[in-house]
């Protein structure tokens, strides 16, 4: 049994880091493998993650981490029984993938304005809470070409757009994702999408 693709890990900078790797053949990850992880710090102890299958030869492990600070560094040991298959390290602050925003809502009752709001996925005491920026994706269910991205570079989790920038009388969907420049993170996953029917009064044209 050998590791084909070494584990790569990302942290949500809150409580979970996710490591993925590939073995050289079909593997029952949960029964055959264990990923041990230990914070490099005085008096810390090793903890065990039981991996799950992620495709035939792929494995994924969700490491519980209490919380994260920038100095944290972890040792990782991948074991198959008594055999050490791989040894590495992981610094969560250098491999951050934020949590996806939630509770995306489209408010259509503001005259001729669409107000999209969502929730910051972090509690206020987390460092990322005040460092997230967002991308909002809006697309038409009827027209694949009608696809647009709005970058939200301010901290408030909301976006206002004129209803008239979208076509009237058709359904749209929106989703949002987050990233943090301070840690040069990857983008989060997209939030679940929300759907609404866009309708607004065309301005009366005088001839």
């Amino acid at each position: 049994m050998k590791v084909l693709q070494e584990p790569t890990c990302v942290s949500d900078y809150m409580s979970i880091s996710t490591c993925e790797w590939k073995m050289n053949g079909p593997t029952n990850c949960s029964t055959e493998l264990r990923l041990l992880y230990q914070l490099v710090f005085l008096l810390s102890e090793a903890h065990t993650c039981i991996p799950e299958n992620n495709g035939g030869a792929g494995c994924v492990c969700h490491l519980l981490m209490d919380d994260v600070v920038s100095a944290d560094n972890y040792t990782l040991d991948l074991w198959a029984g008594q055999q050490l298959l791989w040894k590495g390290s992981f610094k969560p602050s250098e491999h951050v993938k934020p949590r996806a925003p939630g509770n995306l809502t489209v408010h259509t009752n503001v005259s001729d304005t669409l107000l999209l709001t969502w929730s910051n996925p972090y509690p206020p005491d987390n460092y990322l809470y005040n460092h997230l920026t967002y991308a909002v994706n809006i697309w038409s269910e009827n027209d694949p070409a009608d696809f647009r991205i709005y970058n939200v570079t301010y901290l408030e989790p909301s976006l206002r757009i004129a209803a008239s920038t979208l076509k009237s009388g058709i359904s749209y969907r929106a989703r949002v994702r987050a990233w943090a420049q301070c840690y040069n993170t990857t983008w989060s996953e997209w939030s679940p999408s929300t759907k609404w029917h866009n309708s607004y009064r065309e301005p009366f044209e005088q001839h």
Partner: antibody, heavy 125, light 112 residues
Framework: EVQLVESGGGLEQPGGSLRLSCAGS????????MTWVRQAPGKGLEWVSS????????YYADSVKGRFTISRDNSKNTLYLQMNSLRAEDTAVYYC??????????????????WGQGTTVTVSS | DIVMTQSPLSLPVTPGEPASISCRSS???????????LDWYLQKSGQSPQLLIY???NRASGVPDRFSGSGSGTDFTLKISRVEAEDVGFYYC?????????FGQGTKLEIK
């Protein structure tokens, strides 16, 4: 009530051995690291040794390394300090203290928040 | 090893007056994000040490609020807002960022 009680001190000749014990009660003993601190007569406090909750990690002061062994029996809620090759400069009151919570991935530190009453070790010929 | 230096070593105080003890470390005790591994202990005559302050500024359970800790990095201070007779004893700072844990020399607080 959270409590630590030391025992095992006494008078020993240079080169001799003693084993100190520290019995914990009122808390989940295995979840905490434990530490030994000593105080020579008329002197300040000196750290001696620490051990993680499971006993897998141990640390020693240079002055006792190779002579003292820290260990624990979590089934008995007891911490030990085996002291061999004793020297006159090991004469001190020895305290055990509760250290950080190591059951979590990050050891949570609340100071050395519980101390025993101390046990006196005298090394003299 | 991290060297801890306390001052003053002797501190005569009038009851009701404030008192302040300084502790300096030879290297930063800040692990990250403000986790400063610096504690203050009081040892009264004939007794075991007792924890006053942990992680530089957190008051231990049962410690009167006249005791406060501050500082970060290498400079730390213990303040007693109004000294009482029962506060006499030796005060020690201690770092637990790395082994060996190291203590300051101790400050003897006495009543004038």
């Amino acid at each position: 009530e959270v409590q630590l009680v030391e025992s095992g001190g006494g008078l020993e000749q240079p080169g001799g051995s003693l084993r100190l014990s520290c019995a914990g009660s009122g808390f989940t003993f295995r979840d905490y690291a434990m530490t030994w601190v000593r105080q020579a007569p008329g002197k300040g406090l000196e750290w001696v040794s620490s051990i993680s909750g499971s006993g897998s990690n141990t640390y020693y002061a240079d002055s006792v390394k190779g002579r003292f062994t820290i260990s624990r029996d979590n089934s008995k809620n007891t911490l030990y300090l085996q002291m061999n090759s004793l020297r006159a400069e090991d004469t001190a009151v020895y305290y055990c203290a509760r250290d950080r919570l190591t059951a979590a991935v990050r050891p949570y530190y609340y100071g050395l928040d519980v101390w025993g009453q101390g046990t006196t070790v005298t090394v003299s010929s | 090893d991290i060297v801890m230096t306390q001052s003053p070593l002797s501190l005569p105080v009038t009851p009701g007056e404030p008192a302040s003890i300084s502790c300096r470390s030879s290297q930063s005790l800040d692990y990250s994000s403000g986790y400063n591994y610096l504690d203050w202990y009081l040892q009264k005559s004939g007794q075991s040490p007792q924890l006053l302050i942990y992680l530089a500024s957190n008051r231990a359970s049962g410690v009167p609020d006249r005791f406060s800790g501050s500082g970060s990095g290498t400079d730390f201070t213990l303040k007693i807002s109004r000294v009482e007779a029962e506060d006499v004893g030796f005060y020690y700072c201690m770092q637990s960022l790395q082994t060996p844990y190291t203590f300051g020399q101790g400050t003897k607080l006495e009543i004038k």
